[in-house]
Interface confidence: medium
Amino acid sequence: LTCLGGFASPGPVPPSTALRELIEELVNITQNQKAPLCNGSMVWSINLTAGMYCAALESLINVSGCSAIEKTQRMLSGFCPHKVSAGQFSSLHVRDTKIEVAQFVKDLLLHLKKLFREGQFN
């Protein structure tokens, strides 16, 4: 069984399905947001280019105790070929630029939708 985002599915998950499910989760986060997401925690901004999945995970993994993004963290790990742990710093991060998690999620969502629309699933 392949487990993606906490849901078991029979056999490998097609890349298009995995990306769509990640988009769905980010949509849910943005639409269901009541209080400031993750108590207004700040994360490193990233360049939305090749390797951005790992960079996004490296940023978000430094946010602890925020259940709202735990599923997103798990899903992003499925897109990143190497193990990511807290404290890692990628060259894709925009140095000295931090943004709120809520804005990070919105920016990532818009970019992932663009990739989905263009058929760039990997």
Partner: nanobody, 117 residues
């Protein structure tokens, strides 16, 4: 209270066309992604198409790409699905849903589309 009411389903011959509508109420329609999903007899839910709340950009499952067109009229709080070149395998109950893909929080009662000669 959020309500989604689908209409436009029916019996159509293979190769024919149908236009489904979904009247939405109870929320700010223009601000949300909307989707169509379907359930064929004896099968699970299948995502068909989504449209952004703003943009609007559209997204399609490979099985309907080039045949189906999703659109919306925010002034009428209505979502549409134009279905052309229908096939027997398109037979299903079609649901309008608030959200993207299958990650929706509200959906309608559905409208049955039967493609048969």
């Amino acid at each position: 209270e959020v309500q989604l009411l689908e209409s436009g389903g029916g019996l159509v011959q293979p190769g024919g066309s149908l236009r489904l509508s979904c009247a939405a109420s109870g929320f700010t329609f223009g601000g949300y992604d909307m989707s169509w999903v379907r359930q064929a007899p004896g099968k699970g839910l299948e995502w068909v198409s989504s449209i952004d709340g703003v943009g609007p950009h559209t997204y399609y499952a490979d099985s309907v790409k080039g045949r189906f067109t999703i659109s919306r009229d925010n002034s009428k709080n209505t979502l549409y699905l134009q279905m052309n070149s229908l096939r027997a395998e398109d037979t299903a109950v079609y649901y309008c849903a608030k959200g993207f893909g299958l990650g929706f929080d509200y959906w309608g009662q559905g409208t049955l589309v039967t493609v048969s000669s």
